[in-house]
């Protein structure tokens, strides 16, 4: 091997990557907020809805300070993968009923997928433990009725909104530690 010529900066520094990940998360949070407003407008919710298959909220904002970078990224990626699966299920199961929410739901799915890629790349660059492969998840049961599907949509978008809000706070805090 000869003398090192050096190489140009090939790709963003992980700290810059974290910045763009925060921006993407914020934009996804806004997408989710707008979609929730649309859903409530077209199909008013009668109280809060939940779905047993959704992940529980990772952490309260107050407890963020004690978190470490690996646990935040790992948990966030696992939760977002679950939400991606739920959004895909929602679009498949409720295609005709939620037609009024397309193409926004499709855009949400695409951006969620992009955010997951970004998080994985960040974990690779930092050499943090990678998530194990997803065990084959039992297929989500189709909603029992149109209204059941709409309740599920409220639960999915509401949970995703809370998760993304937590994610923005967590990522901003982590940036100070990197």
């Amino acid at each position: 091997p000869g003398p090192p010529p050096g190489s140009p900066r090939a790709s963003p520094d992980p700290r810059a990557e974290l910045d763009s990940t925060v921006l993407l998360t914020r934009s996804l949070l806004e997408d989710t907020r707008q979609l929730t407003i649309q859903l409530k407008d077209k199909f008013p919710a009668d109280g809060d809805h939940n779905l047993d298959s959704l992940p529980t909220l990772a952490m309260s904002a107050g407890a963020l300070g004690a978190l470490q970078l690996p646990s935040v990224l790992t948990r966030l990626r696992a939760d977002l993968l679950s939400y991606l699966r739920h959004v895909q299920w929602l679009r498949r199961a409720m295609g005709s009923s939620l037609k009024t929410l397309e193409p926004e739901l499709g855009t949400l799915q695409t951006r969620l997928d992009r955010l997951l890629r970004r998080l994985q790349l960040l974990m690779s660059r930092l050499a943090l433990p990678q998530l194990p492969p997803d065990p084959p998840a039992p297929p989500l049961a189709p909603p029992s009725s149109t209204w059941g599907g709409i309740r599920a949509a409220h639960a999915i978008l509401g949970g995703l909104h809370l998760t993304l809000d937590w994610a923005v706070r967590g990522l901003l805090l982590l940036k100070t530690r990197l």
Epitope: S7, S11, L121, S124, R125, A127, L128, P133
Partner: antibody
Framework: EVQLLESGGGLVQPGGSLRLSCAAS????????GHWVRQAPGKGLEWVAL????????YYADSVKGRFTISRDNSKNTLYLQMNSLRAEDTAVYYC???????WGQGTLVTVSS | QSVLTQPPSASGTPGQRVTISCSGS?????????VHWYQQLPGTAPKLLIY???ERPSGVPDRFSGSKSGTSASLAISGLRSEDEADYYC???????????FGGGTKLTVL
């Protein structure tokens, strides 16, 4: 300009030890995971070891587990590979790399022979 | 025997399009882990060519593109040039081995 400069390679007898160093410059080394990847003469790339950006996680290929130790000193922008109980099959050019890896050094040759 | 399988050689004439495949399993490429591609010109260190399946680092021409589907990935080079003659390696994280793995490499010859 990004630079990774390996040193410490050379000729060593089977059972012997060597410590490789890799000095990084031109980028925020402390924000990247550090790798050692080797390439035996005329062969392909083989990943050897990996350490997280802050040194808290270390990963090793089965072929070097228990014999090699990866470490880093972010205050010196340096990555290390301590190689013990060296064998003839460890003969290779050893590259230090950072990120996925995004950046690579030019390599240092380690020859294990009696 | 590499964990990721690549054809040992590939060839093409200048201007042609060439594709190099990389086949893995459910513990690496098939587990939603990103695939990266490296180019190693004769006598030099490897260089990152494609990261995260299809992203190009700055400075890499858009003649190079990557894709991934299921447990396989591929690198496509269009408008082949003599300076593309090199060894190409794919890489991905492997969960069962708890580390990155490389393909055996593909030697590309420009005829």
């Amino acid at each position: 300009e990004v630079q990774l400069l390996e040193s410490g390679g050379g000729l060593v007898q089977p059972g012997g030890s060597l410590r490789l160093s890799c000095a990084a410059s031109g980028f925020t080394f402390s924000s990247y995971g550090g790798h050692w990847v080797r390439q035996a003469p005329g062969k392909g790339l083989e990943w050897v070891a990996l350490i997280s950006y802050d040194g808290s996680y270390k990963y090793y290929a089965d072929s070097v587990k228990g014999r090699f130790t990866i470490s880093r000193d972010n205050s010196k922008n340096t990555l290390y590979l301590q190689m013990n109980s060296l064998r003839a099959e460890d003969t290779a050019v050893y590259y230090c790399a950072a990120g996925v890896p995004d950046y690579w050094g030019q390599g240092t040759l380690v020859t294990v022979s009696s | 025997q590499s964990v990721l399988t690549q054809p040992p050689s590939a060839s093409g004439t200048p201007g042609q399009r060439v594709t190099i495949s990389c086949s893995g399993s459910s513990s690496n490429i098939g587990s939603d882990y990103d695939v990266h591609w490296y180019q190693q010109l004769p006598g030099t260190a490897p260089k990152l060519l494609i990261y995260s399946n299809n992203e190009r680092p700055s400075g890499v021409p858009d003649r190079f593109s990557g894709s991934k589907s299921g447990t396989s990935a591929s690198l496509a080079i269009s408008g082949l040039r003599s300076e593309d003659e090199a060894d190409y390696y794919c890489a991905a994280w492997d969960f069962s081995l708890s580390g990155p793995v490389f393909g055996g490499g593909t030697k590309l010859t420009v005829l």
